[in-house]
Each structure stands twice: as C-alpha cells, then as structure tokens.
Interface confidence: low
C-alpha cells in the first residue's frame, strides 16, 4: 500500500496482436490498441500507416476500411498517435495473423496428442497455430 | 449453441413498412457482421446487407439503398431489418445470417405483401 | 456488381454419382463459398474460402478454384444432397449469390 505506480505516455506495448478469419469485412472491428494518457489531459489522435486498409478510432479501436483477404502483405503495420497540441508521436506495431482453418486445427490437435509420444517429431507443430473455439 | 431466431411471418398492404428481428444467442453478439438475404416464392438467394453490432456501422445493397435499414439492440443481441415502401415484389422470406463464416442462419420470416 | 453464373441451372443425377457444379464470376473474387437448401429450409453452409469443408458437412463435398472459375465437387451423391446449391462471393459488395443449381433424382 502507499505505492505509487509510475505510468508512462504512450503504448504499454510494442506489439498488439490480432488473430481473424482469413476474409476481412469493411468496418469490421480488428483489435484496441491502448494508448496510456497518463495525465489524462493529452488530445491524441491516430493515424495508420496503411490508411487505405486500416483506420483508427478516437478510441484506438483498428478497423478495416474495406473488404480484403488477410495475407502476408496486410500482415504487419504500424499505429502512429500524436498529441494534437505538443505534436508529439509514438507508434506501435500491429501484427495480424491468420486464424487457423478447421483443418489445421485437426492437424494440430493431432499433434498435440502424438507429441506426448514423438515430442521431437512433432514439435514443428507447437507454437504456430493458435486453436479458437468456434 | 449458436441460435438465431427471427421474428413471426408478416402479410402488409403495398405502401406499407415491416421491421423483422433476429435474436442472437449462444456467441458474442458483437464479434461478427450479421447479413440481411431474401428469397422471393420459387427464387434464389439475394443479399440485402450487413450490420456490423460492434460499431452499428451498415452496408446495403444499392437495390435497397433508401427502403432498407438495419439496426441493432445490443442490450438483446437482437438485430432489426426494416423494408419500407413495400411492394407485391417485396414477397418473400427473410433470413438473418451470421456467425465467424455466415454460417449461422435464422429460419426465415415469410413478408407477403398484397392488397 | 459481380454477378455470379452457375452451370447447370439443373442437373438429374443417381445416388453413387460424381457431380461438379461450376460458378463464374464475372471479374475476379478471391474466395468462393457454398450453400445447399432444401425446400422450406434456410441456405446451410457447406464450403468457406473456396475449399475449406464446413463443421459436419461430409467429407464428400469438396471446393476449388480460383480467380473467376469455381467448382463445387460432390463425389459420391446421396440421397440426402439432392437439394438446390449456391455459390456466393464475400469480395466486393453486394456480396452476391449465383442463381442456384438444383440436383434432382434422376
């Protein structure tokens, strides 16, 4: 008790990620991205570095401006905040990653019941696929 | 499990508007875009447009552009689909359809419209 | 818009058949999804992003293509998949349906 916790301007971190189904609607919300307004006074505003495919709400909710199939080209890019008055920025990386199809998932269900038995053999598997529940 | 449950079949007089609900269950309500399609006595599918719950943001068909509004109640995971200015083309059954692939459909309203 | 033609409008089969249905879109869309409908019915999905099998649809309906040309495969038809099937383009909107193909018993 008695601490004071110290807060830092700007993005907490230096990756937001995101998992999404490979077709990417228009106005579809992606994820948040927390920008940490310490004194609480600060006006910032966010700009996306891929503007034709990705905005960015006063409330540093990502949308998708159109319509796209997620690929490796939409992949990763970056979130920029200014402060309206200072002109101060900061930025942060946004990584998108595909959520698996029904068959990875098998596959990877699969594994992980062998990897029990053939750990080695089958460890490429681990890691790479995250499993949603649908 | 994932349920969408749409509203009573409806029988209006041309001129006249109909909103149809669609009561979403068993998933986040706000997670995916939810779909307007009809299909006419005898015909085949068209899309009228979405709704996305999570900003109320809404695309249309063109077709409809000015007849067609979409709408949502969060607080009932319920979407609304409103047609107005209906006409005896305008007969047909209306489906809601969502979900992570639009692979949820409700069961369908049947709309007649006659004099 | 885009409109998508599907081929045949109908098509008469037996049980144990191989059936190919085609849908061509008229400018290219990135991925194909599939619907069977059974009178009185809602629309139920069968193939998403092209050839991606949907929850507890047999492994014998399977999709392909690519670009404007799409097919949809039923390898060994039976008696239940005699229905009417649509393809749909999720790329541009409005996101439009083929005009549908009906599979009757021959």
């Known amino acids: 008790s008695g601490e004071i916790a110290l807060c830092k301007t700007g993005f907490p971190e230096d990756v937001y990620s995101a998992v999404l189904s490979k077709d990417v609607h228009e106005g579809q919300p992606l994820l948040n991205v927390k920008f940490s307004n310490c004194n609480g006074k600060r006006k910032v505003q966010y700009e996306s570095s891929e503007p034709a495919d990705f905005k960015v709400d006063e409330d540093g909710m990502v949308y998708a401006v159109r319509s796209f199939p997620l690929s490796s080209e939409h992949a990763k890019f970056l979130i920029y905040a200014q402060d309206k008055e200072t002109q101060e920025k900061w930025q942060v990386a946004v990584k998108l990653s595909l959520k698996p199809t029904l068959t990875e998932e098998s596959v990877k269900e699969s594994a992980e019941v062998e990897e029990i038995v053939f750990p080695r053999q089958f460890s490429k598997h681990s890691g790479h696929l995250q499993r949603q529940k649908r | 499990e994932v349920q969408l449950v749409e509203s009573g079949a409806e029988v209006k007089k041309p001129g006249a508007s109909v909103k149809v609900s669609c009561k979403a269950s068993g998933y986040t309500f706000t997670s995916y875009l939810m779909h307007w399609v009809r299909q006419a006595p005898g015909q085949g599918l068209e899309w009228m447009g979405y709704i996305n719950p999570y900003i109320d943001v809404t695309k249309y068909n063109e077709k409809f552009k000015g007849r067609v509004t979409m709408t949502r109640d969060t607080s009932t995971s319920t979407v609304y689909m409103e047609l107005s200015s209906l006409r005896s083309e305008d007969t047909a059954v209306y489906y809601c359809?969502?979900?992570?692939?639009?692979?949820?459909w409700g069961q369908g309203t049947l709309v007649t419209v006659s004099s | 818009e885009i409109v998508l033609t599907q081929s045949p409008s109908s098509l008469s089969a037996s049980v144990g058949d191989r059936v190919t249905i085609t849908c061509r879109a008229s400018?290219?869309?990135?991925?194909m999804y599939w619907y069977q409908q059974k009178p009185g019915k809602a629309p139920k999905l069968l193939i998403y992003?092209?050839?991606n099998l949907a929850p507890g649809v047999p492994s014998r309906f399977s999709g392909s293509g690519s670009g404007t040309d799409f097919t949809l495969t039923i390898s060994s038809l039976q008696p239940e998949d005699f229905a009417t099937y649509y393809c749909q383009q999720f790329s541009s909107p409005p996101f439009t349906f083929g005009q549908g193909t009906k599979l009757e018993i021959k």
């Open positions: 400018s290219s869309v990135n991925y």
């Open positions: 992003y092209t050839s």
């Open positions: 359809a969502g979900g992570d692939y639009e692979d949820y």
